[in-house]
Interface confidence: low
């Protein structure tokens, strides 16, 4: 028998695939500064291979550390507006449990659209991250300029 | 015998290692908004394991879903020019088959000269994507400022 | 035996789980560019598991192709002063062992005051990378808006 | 050359439906958001609906929501809007427009067909 | 009653220069785009984003916004600008909404 089998074998559904991408559903009423995301097939190109949806928000299924990146542009925004609207925020962030309330990733429009950026960080099962934009501006939902979505990458 | 080798066991051959990592070559003649790439060692840094170039776009070799990630930095920019020829956009998408044909990913370059982001997506063998970058303003070849890559993340 | 055990199995620990993610430890002295990193559970959400940190620079433990990534927000930082400061830019690269170095990523700020990017790139045991911020401007220490990592994606 | 083509207007009575087609040639169909906006005999431009790229987000304005349905192929260049429950203020030059895809942008109509007659009368 | 105020009519005399505003509160936060249509015609862009103009628009279009207002200037009306003059924006959901429409003589 072949060395690499005498060593630890990794089974298929162990690999930890989880992985989700999904697109903007809504903003929130006033004083709720969170992006409300949806996800699967049906909408288009987004998807949830393991992470669910809880009211909007993404919860993690299992532990590890994941890759979590985001785009987000700003709707009817030109560089005169973004500046004009200053500051407009957004920022990725562990909301729940709250003992592990944390922010995540975090950028300001400044004079542009649109902010992306990725990073890779330690989710536990049952974490609940939230994207809040704050200022006076709406994200588009163009499906291609705002997307949110997470990646597990190892144990 | 071991547990996890009474489950399914994953060869190598099948991890889908696809990956691609590419440089601009040159853009398209006029009416032709799309940047045409190369790859490979002799080239410097990039890369093809798996996707292929036709005709300086990229073909996928294997179903999946992928990390797409991009940068695109304009040639000869400040932000002064960046505005004045404004708007200078960067989109990338599936170009063929034509029935699939959809826009994966959109950004505009405002007052800035560099774009850059990443999304996760569904591909599926023989998808070709495109890079169009529409505006009067060319990319720069530098291989640190300009590229454009794919990396097999599941099945 | 079924036909997957049949072929090259894929022990665990082969799989190059070599992964970081790093945040801002301190800039240096007068005329060393250089971004110093630092990581670890006890900092909060940054880590190490393969690469090293050298005088705060990342080197690599394993050969591959590597997703790198990096974010950086300049602190005390609105356009206006990314504009009156400009150039500020960052680059990363291989800065040792000298017959390798070469710039991977490079982004300037322009009227923003966040850059980021990613890239794949390959990789060998003992390069070490070092991220260039050059101009007057300093960057945010911020976990959430300066970062630094590199993901192990194949062979 | 940007061409948008309308066809499938005409008369029809109160309550009854009409489909009109949009057929979009020279330019890369499947990046643009797209809306049909409508001219009522002497009067000015009304908005309608409009739908993302991917065709899996639609919006409508409230004086068609529940009546009007827009849609599209992207794989024949083609957008649609099916009007049922028509009412007689519905009469109007329909157009199919292009969004320029600045789309972070307020929508801005750069391409515009010759538009198609609705009627609608007993 | 359209969201986007702007004048009925407009009169300016050959050469001369002409100005349409459009008042809304929606321009306080958003772009304004404006249109020219003539009689039979469908609409054609003539200026984006309060004050860009695209290819093929003579120079003598021009836009500006300040708060709540937007106006397209006309320098040296010619003959063939008359026709009529749509201001457009968005509402809060990103909606397109229009002005009522000026119509434009040049006399």
């Known amino acids: 028998q072949r060395f690499a089998q005498a060593q630890q074998q990794l089974p298929l559904e162990s690999l930890g695939w989880d992985v989700a991408e999904l697109q903007l559903n809504h903003t929130g009423p006033q004083q709720d500064p969170r992006l409300y995301w949806q996800g699967g097939p049906a909408l288009g190109r987004s998807f949830l291979h393991g992470p669910e949806l809880d009211k909007g928000q993404l919860r993690i299924h299992r532990d590890g550390i994941y890759m979590v990146h985001i785009q987000v542009t700003l709707a009817i925004c030109s560089s005169t507006t973004a500046s004009r609207h200053h500051p407009t925020t957004l920022a990725v962030g562990i909301c729940s449990p709250a003992s592990r309330s944390i922010s995540l990733l975090r950028l300001s429009f400044h004079q542009g659209c649109t902010i992306a950026s990725q990073r890779l960080t330690p989710l536990a099962r049952g974490d609940t991250l939230c994207t809040n934009l704050t200022g006076t501006l709406l994200p588009s939902r163009n499906t291609d300029e705002t997307f949110f979505g997470v990646q597990w990458v190892r144990p | 015998q071991r547990f996890a080798q009474a489950q399914q066991q994953l060869p190598l051959e099948s991890l889908g290692w696809d990956v691609a990592e590419l440089q601009l070559n040159h853009t398209g003649p006029q009416q032709d908004p799309r940047l045409y790439w190369q790859g490979g060692p002799a080239l410097g840094r990039s890369f093809l394991h798996g996707p292929e170039l036709d005709k300086g776009q990229l073909r996928i070799h294997r179903d999946g879903i992928y990390m797409v990630h991009i940068q695109v930095t304009l040639a000869i920019c400040s932000s002064t020019t960046a505005s004045r020829h404004h708007p200078t956009t960067l989109a990338v998408g599936i170009c063929s088959p034509a029935s699939r044909s959809i826009s994966l990913l959109r950004l505009s370059f405002h007052q800035g000269c560099t774009i850059a982001s990443q999304r996760l997506t569904p591909l599926a063998r023989g998808d070709t994507l495109c890079t169009n970058l529409t505006g009067t303003l060319l990319p720069s070849r530098n291989t640190d400022e300009t590229f454009f890559g794919v990396q097999w993340v599941r099945p | 035996q079924r036909f997957a055990q049949a072929q090259q199995q894929l022990p665990l620990e082969s799989l190059g789980w070599d992964v970081a993610e790093l945040q801002l430890n301190h800039t240096g002295p007068q005329q060393d560019p250089r971004l110093y990193w630092q990581g670890g559970p006890a900092l909060g959400r940054s880590f190490l598991h393969g690469p090293e940190l050298d005088k705060g620079q990342l080197r690599i433990h394993r050969d591959g192709i590597y997703m790198v990534h990096i974010q950086v927000t300049l602190a005390i930082c609105s356009s206006t002063t990314a504009s009156r400061h400009h150039p500020t830019t960052l680059a990363v690269g291989i800065c040792s062992p000298a017959s390798r170095s070469i710039s991977l990523l490079r982004l300037s700020f322009h009227q923003g005051c966040t850059i980021a990017s990613q890239r794949l790139t390959p990789l060998a045991r003992g390069d070490t990378l070092c991220t260039n911020l050059t101009g007057t401007l300093l960057p945010s220490r911020n976990t959430d808006e300066t970062f630094f990592g590199v993901q192990w994606v194949r062979p | 050359e940007v061409q948008l083509v309308e066809s499938g207007g005409g008369l029809v009575q109160p309550g009854g439906s009409l489909r009109l087609s949009c057929a979009a040639s020279g330019f890369t169909f499947s990046v643009y958001y797209m809306n049909w906006v409508r001219q009522a005999p002497g009067k000015g431009l009304e908005w309608v609906s409009d739908?993302?790229?991917?065709?899996?987000?639609?919006y409508y304005a409230d004086s068609v929501k529940g009546r009007f349905t827009i849609s599209r192929d992207n794989a024949k260049n083609t957008l649609t809007l099916q009007m049922n429950s028509l009412k007689p203020e519905d009469t109007a030059l329909y157009y199919c427009?292009?969004?320029?895809?600045?789309?972070?942008?307020?929508?801005?109509?750069?391409?515009w067909g010759q538009g198609t007659q609705v009627i609608v009368a007993s | 009653q359209s969201a986007l105020t702007q004048p009925s009519t407009v009169s300016v005399s050959l050469g001369q220069t002409a100005r349409i505003t459009c008042r809304g509160d929606?321009?306080?936060?958003?772009?304004t785009n404006w249109y020219q249509q003539k009689p039979g015609q469908a609409p054609v862009l003539v200026i984006y984003d309060d004050d860009s103009r695209p290819s093929g628009i003579p120079e003598r279009f021009s836009g500006s916004s300040s708060g709540a207002t937007a106006a397209l200037t006309i320098s040296g009306a010619q003959a063939e600008d008359e026709g009529d003059y749509y201001c457009q924006s968005a509402d809060s959901s990103g909606n397109a909404v229009f002005g009522g429409g000026t119509h434009l003589t040049v006399l």
């Open positions: 427009v292009r969004d320029a895809g600045y789309s972070n942008h307020v929508p801005i109509f750069d391409s």
């Open positions: 739908i993302n790229n991917e065709g899996g987000t639609t």
């Open positions: 929606s321009l306080e936060r958003y772009g």
